[in-house]
Interface confidence: low
């Protein structure tokens, strides 16, 4: 570690005196710069010497000597005071810049250590410090404002009591810069714009930043627009607003508009699309199939997407029949706006009743005219089954009627014993009717089919069951003969599969 002669750590001299500072080390040594022109620097063997023949208060500061070859990187320092009775302060910098919440060193060095007891920090022209200014003083370094705030960016003077009067330093300007967390915040309004050719339009690009040093511009496709900028300050932020006003839009005004703002932290941009159309438009669509099938008792939401400009002047859901003249309850109709020109309209149909099957139409109107979108709603029903004994052309016949939607298929079962329903263990024969006769098939209604089982005699100890099923469910009806007779069999023309 190098050694400084005189040994220090402080040396007090008067103006005009000769001062010699010698630094000696094991190897070559050097003084930390920059050394002011008032000093003469020369080498004397392994030592480096700083000397001045006419010390002034401006020589007041700490001088540090290092030994570059020392692996431990040791250094030695001495603080020189040149106590000038007219100049209590040596100011090393007229301007200090820090970020908020950093400590700010105001480098006014006291030229006479005796004066330390009477020092204070004031704002320019002796004004007091702002409240909550927390500071400390070091005669070697100056005043430190701890955790400086933006509002403390002011002109300061260091004050010392000399012979009963306060003597000020020259002023030091402290600049406290706000810590910029990121690029400016942006808004571009509207997020989307549609206009008919000849209409007026306005696009507003605004950016805000915590300090005034930021730029903002509005760009149309790849062209930067020259728009006057309005500046403001509120909510502790600087605002810059660009407003593009178009009296009569044309197709060349259409396209992508980008609002771009930048500061030292980087760039931020947001875009919108401006569409210019020849005339009003109104488009209805649905992501759903327009033909809907729902099981009775369940619920359904019908959704329509509307794209329109200008805005809608009217809209409603209408039930077109065929079952009743009821209309959808308004409380079941819901409208949500996805954005300015796109809307979703929903009709909720909970716990559907048979009378609610049919056509539902959504109608909308704007200056472009009327449009409608119609859904066809068919209800699904599980089969209902009934069996009767009848005589057809002199032959005894079991007649099974099954009603449901979708159209039920029919299966006959013959099983041993008397039972409400044949189970697999009891089944003696199975016949599937491939083409039951359709008795009725009206839109939005159940399909009724009929299947015949011709029997010469029915055995009294057996059960004949008609089963019908569709995608919703199944139904069955068991028939038990009352008197004994010959065993039944399927007629040839039935083409049943055993």
């Amino acid at each position: 570690i190098p050694v400084i002669e005189p040994s220090g750590p402080e040396l007090v001299v008067k103006p005009g005196e000769t001062v010699t500072l010698r630094c000696v080390g094991n190897g070559s040594v050097e003084w930390d710069g920059p050394i002011s022109p008032h000093w003469t620097l020369y080498s004397d063997g392994p030592s480096s010497v700083l000397t001045t023949n006419n010390a002034t208060f401006q020589n007041t500061r700490t001088y540090r000597c290092t030994e570059p070859g020392d692996p431990l990187g040791g250094s030695a320092a001495i603080h020189l005071y040149v106590k000038d009775p007219a100049r209590p302060w040596n100011v090393l910098a007229k301007e200090v810049v820090v970020f908020e919440d950093q400590d700010a060193l105001l480098p006014c060095l006291l030229t006479d250590p005796v004066l330390e007891a009477g020092v204070s920090l004031v704002r320019l022209r002796g004004r007091p410090l702002l409240r909550h200014t927390n500071y400390s003083f070091s005669p070697w370094h100056g005043f430190i404002i701890h955790r400086a705030k933006f509002i403390q960016g002011q002109d300061y003077q260091c004050s010392a009591l000399m012979g009963g009067r306060k003597v000020m330093s020259i002023s030091i300007r402290l600049k406290v810069q706000k810590v910029i967390p990121g690029p400016p915040a942006l808004t571009l309004v509207p997020a989307e714009l549609v206009r008919i050719r000849g209409e007026a339009a306005q696009i507003v690009c605004s950016a805000s930043n915590i300090d005034v040093d930021f730029d903002v511009f509005l760009q149309h496709n790849t062209t930067k627009l020259a728009i006057p900028q309005r500046s403001d300050f509120h909510d502790n932020r600087y605002q810059k607003v660009l407003t593009l006003s178009l009296g009569q839009v044309d197709f060349q005004h259409a396209g992508n508009y980008s609002c771009v703002a930048s500061n030292v932290q980087g760039k931020h941009s947001t875009s919108m699309f401006f569409q210019v159309v020849e005339s009003a438009y109104l488009d209805l669509s649905s992501e759903q199939n327009l033909i809907q099938e729902v099981t009775v008792g369940e619920g359904l939401n019908l959704k329509v997407m509307v794209e329109a400009y200008p805005g809608l002047q009217g809209f409603n859901w209408t039930y077109l029949g065929p079952f009743s003249d009821h209309q959808p309850e308004p409380k079941l109709a819901n409208a949500t706006t996805k954005d300015t020109y796109r809307h979703t309209f929903t009709l909720s149909l909970p716990r559907l009743k048979p009378s609610e099957a049919g056509r539902y139409s959504f109608l909308a109107r704007n200056p472009g005219g009327w449009r409608a979108l119609t859904f066809e709603l068919t209800l699904r029903y599980p089969p209902e089954v009934s069996v009767i004994w009848t005589s057809i052309n002199g032959s005894g016949t079991l007649l099974c009627a099954a009603s449901g939607y979708p159209q039920p298929n029919v299966t006959w079962l013959q099983c041993a014993g008397h039972t409400d329903r044949c189970d697999e263990a009891q089944v003696l024969q199975v016949w599937v009717d491939p083409h039951p006769e359709v008795l009725s098939q009206e839109p939005f209604q159940k399909v009724t089919v009929q299947s015949l089982l011709t029997a010469e005699t029915l055995e009294h100890n057996q059960t004949y069951e008609c089963r019908a099923h569709n995608s919703v469910g199944s139904g069955s009806w068991a028939f038990i003969p009352i008197s004994a007779g010959a065993r039944t069999h399927p007629p040839d023309e039935f083409l049943f599969t055993p």
Epitope: K94, V167, K175
Partner: antibody, heavy 126, light 107 residues
Framework: EVTLKESGPALVKPTQTLTLTCTFS??????????VGWIRQPPGKALEWLAN???????YYNPSLKNRLTISKDTSKNQVVLTMTNMDPVDTATYYC??????????????????WGQGTMVTVSS | DIQMTQSPSSLSASVGDRVTITCLAS??????LAWYQQKPGKAPKLLIY???SLQDGVPSRFSGSGSGTDYTLTISSLQPEDFATYYC?????????FGGGTKVEIK
């Protein structure tokens, strides 16, 4: 008595370098807190600050011209020199030097131009 | 950079009139403002410093006021020798910037 006087060529050609000298008396630029600045004024237009130099050789430049300006001082001759490179016809103006000061103990420093030279008209033309 | 917007750019007044010139800074300049008077063919002359302090030798009819971003130069009773162009200068932050000037003419 404080006086300042600008000197330099009345006519320079485009792309040439302008060198202006401010010779002053009545104060010293070695005095603690003292400074000298340059200001210009195009014909019929407002004043524009160019550069300052302080007693401790601290220098400040107008960022819009920083790459073209150099300010220096010769305290032994009581002179401040401003050079401006790559002159253009838009640089046609009256160029003034002015003193910044003085520091009055124990009052505040006066950071303003309190004494001005008479100005020198510089025309940039080919 | 701090912009200094001076208004009006020109005004016509008569001897004895009270004249007010304003300077608006684009951000707070903490009273770091001076006012200068310039007559045709002459160098500017310092009238007011630190927004409101009168320079030695300047008549007391000149006064300065204001704070934050808004500053005013007032001539309480215009004299024949006061017809000139007036400039404000901020030194709150580099680069120091002047206002655009206000020309005071005889009505």
């Amino acid at each position: 008595e404080v006086t300042l006087k600008e000197s330099g060529p009345a006519l320079v050609k485009p792309t040439q370098t302008l060198t202006l000298t401010c010779t002053f008396s009545g104060f010293s630029l070695t005095t603690y807190g003292m400074g000298v600045g340059w200001i210009r004024q195009p014909p019929g237009k407002a004043l524009e600050w160019l550069a300052n130099i302080w007693w401790d050789d601290d220098k400040y430049y107008n960022p819009s011209l920083k790459n073209r300006l150099t300010i220096s001082k010769d305290t032994s001759k009581n002179q401040v020199v401003l050079t401006m490179t790559n002159m253009d016809p838009v640089d046609t103006a009256t160029y003034y030097c002015a003193r910044i000061g003085p520091i009055k103990y124990p009052t505040a420093p006066y950071r303003y131009f309190d004494f001005w030279g008479q100005g020198t008209m510089v025309t940039v033309s080919s | 950079d701090i912009q200094m917007t001076q208004s009006p750019s020109s005004l016509s007044a008569s001897v004895g009139d009270r004249v007010t010139i304003t300077c608006l800074a684009s951000e707070d300049i903490y009273d770091n403002l001076a006012w200068y008077q310039q007559k045709p063919g002459k160098a500017p002359k310092l009238l007011i410093y630190y927004a409101s302090s009168l320079q030695d030798g300047v008549p007391s009819r000149f006064s300065g006021s204001g704070s934050g971003t808004d500053y005013t130069l007032t001539i309480s009773s215009l004299q024949p020798e006061d017809f000139a162009t007036y400039y404000c200068l901020q030194d709150s932050e580099y680069p120091w910037t002047f206002g655009g000037g206000t020309k005071v003419e005889i009505k």
